[in-house]
């Protein structure tokens, strides 16, 4: 079932079906014998009440008041009371656009990213029985797709996607046909959820160290799901019996990134090891960042200015 | 519209150098990193390497080190590479494309080593 | 470096039929911490540059016809089109962005039989 109208100010198009359904609709079904009225006040009038004699186009049933269709003098307040329970709308109606298949005021605004799933659906559940078709167009030319009962486009967002769609569904009533369009203004970003890989700490590192002694270099970043970090060094990777990789340590943070530290392990610090880059390299889709680390000899330590040096 | 355009063919002779150009639209430049393809007449695709543009920083392949320099002007989200000493062998279609899964292609720049 | 390298080098397939490629890497392009392959797939057309079909593997890009899809982990891909058109006759290429030197497989040739 329909869900009923909890707005308080609401804005239509002239020409189109519209209708106003009050919230105590189950409770309304309890008591049936309780009088139920609907009443208008605009400007100079004071709540008059409604009935299918005020006008030929408007229909009252149990919940609903029924607009065939809604036209600029129906702008006003309106009141559903029954018994001590009162709901009250302001309703707005405004120009339709006569240059275009939609008005610009009555436009639902969507950002979708790139890649990310886009979807329009056509339907109208409240008018659903009484809908002959309904054609989906895109800035107002007409997309060829094969439901047209509802039509739908579902798909991975491309830059090309972005424009204004509407749904425009075609109904019968009373031998009169009537349509009702509803306009969605797509705009299509770049992915926001992506950060630019940041290495955290100095770019260069002396670490003082004692040969045959062990160390661990770590390498620590905050990075994208994925996002890459690694170790390099030497000419190959792995020729070094001694140097070992550990696993990748990730914790995600708060904000939906990763926190991801990497430890490069050397056992047995020989001359060979010293003086040499070991560079860790973060990867995105956004290029590389690198930050290296030098083993120096502790005797060495005199050489360098103490605030180069990391533990 | 999201696109790559790239500078006009280039005929150069051996030993010399060569600029391409590659402007980018559509996007926020710095997002993504700007790689060289380069493919040779009825070869394939040969990455020669790529620039961060949010940082400056390069990656090159082996084979162009010391003969390519990748640059980017963010003012004008335009990205350049430049190869030096060129040889016949260079004749190919370079391309620049972004990211590192390649879903945007400039069309393509050839460039002819003759003498 | 890690090195592609795609079987056969070229295939004809009957117009509506199934046509594989494969795609081994030298080494795992499979990243452990977030359990994606980072692996991409490419056709390329005479005149034209390549276009991106196929990333981490097996996620379609936006616009190609989901009779393309793509398989495999670690060192071992396929791409495969279900029902052959006319307009899928062109080169493909697997690409590796695991680690630089980002690498291509040297391609297959697809036509039709």
């Known amino acids: 079932a329909e869900s009923c109208t909890s707005r308080p100010h609401i804005t239509v198009v002239e020409g189109e079906p519209f209708y106003l359904k009050h919230c105590s609709c189950s409770l309304a079904h309890e008591i049936e014998t309780t009088t139920k009225s609907w009443y208008k006040s605009s400007g100079s009038q004071e709540h008059v009440e409604l009935n299918p004699r005020s006008s030929s186009r408007i229909a009252l049933h149990d919940c609903v008041l029924e607009f065939w269709p809604v036209e600029l003098n129906d702008t006003g307040s309106y009141f559903f009371q029954m018994k001590n329970y009162t709901q009250k709308w302001k309703l707005n109606v405004i120009r339709r656009n006569k240059h275009s298949c939609f008005t610009e005021r009555q436009v639902t605004s969507k950002i979708v990213e790139v890649k990310k799933f886009f979807q329009i659906t056509c339907e109208n559940s409240y008018y659903q029985t009484l809908v002959n078709s309904t054609s989906l167009y895109k800035n107002c030319k007409k997309l060829l797709l094969e439901n047209n009962k509802n039509p739908t486009i579902k798909k991975n967002a491309e830059f090309e996607d972005q424009g204004y769609y509407s749904c425009v569904h075609f109904l019968h009533h009373n031998g009169k046909l009537f349509n009702i369009t509803k306009t969605f203004n797509i705009t299509i970003v770049e992915d926001r959820s992506n950060i630019v890989p940041v290495l955290l700490g100095p770019k260069l590192n002396h670490v003082a160290v004692e040969l045959g002694k062990n160390v661990r270099l770590n390498c620590s970043a905050l990075l994208n799901e994925e996002d890459v970090i690694y170790w390099m060094f030497g000419e190959e990777n792995g020729s070094d019996p001694n140097i070992h990789e550990e696993k990748e340590m990730r914790i995600m943070t708060p904000e939906g990134k990763w926190h991801a530290s990497k430890v490069l392990r050397i056992e047995n610090i020989g001359e060979s090891n010293l003086n040499v880059l070991y560079n860790c390299t973060v990867a995105s889709t956004g290029g590389t960042d690198t930050k290296s680390f030098i083993l120096v000899r502790k005797a060495d330590m005199a050489d360098i200015p103490g605030h180069v040096f990391t533990r | 519209q999201v696109q790559l355009v790239q500078s006009g063919a280039e005929v150069k002779k051996p030993g010399a150098s060569v600029k391409v150009s590659c402007k980018a639209s559509g996007y926020t430049f710095s997002s993504y990193g700007i790689s060289w393809v380069r493919q040779a007449p009825g070869q394939g695709l040969e990455w020669m390497g790529w620039?961060?543009?949010?940082?400056?920083?390069?990656d090159y392949a082996q084979k162009f080190q010391g003969r390519v320099t990748m640059t980017t002007d963010t003012s004008t989200s335009t990205a350049y590479m430049e190869l030096r000493s060129l040889r016949s062998d260079d004749t190919a279609i370079y391309f620049c494309?972004?990211?590192?899964?390649?879903?945007?292609w400039g069309r393509g720049t050839l460039v002819t080593v003759s003498s | 470096d890690i090195v592609m390298t795609q079987s056969p080098d070229s295939l004809a397939v009957s117009l509506g039929e199934r046509a594989t490629i494969n795609c081994k890497s030298s080494?795992?392009?499979?990243?452990?911490?977030?359990?994606?392959?980072?692996l991409a797939w490419y056709q390329q057309k005479p005149g034209q540059p390549p276009t991106l079909l196929i990333y981490?593997?097996?996620t379609r890009e936006s616009g190609v016809p989901d009779r393309f899809s793509g398989g495999g982990s670690g060192t071992d891909f396929t791409l495969t089109i279900s029902s052959l058109q006319a307009e899928d006759v062109a080169i493909y290429y697997c690409?590796?962005?695991?680690?630089?030197?980002?690498?291509f497989g040297q391609g297959t040739k697809l036509d039709i039989k």
């Open positions: 981490w593997s097996s």
């Open positions: 690409q590796q962005y695991y680690r630089t030197p980002y690498t």
């Open positions: 620039i961060s543009v949010y940082n400056g920083n390069t």
């Open positions: 080494q795992t392009v499979l990243y452990s911490s977030n359990n994606k392959n980072y």
């Open positions: 494309t972004r990211g590192w899964y390649f879903d945007l």
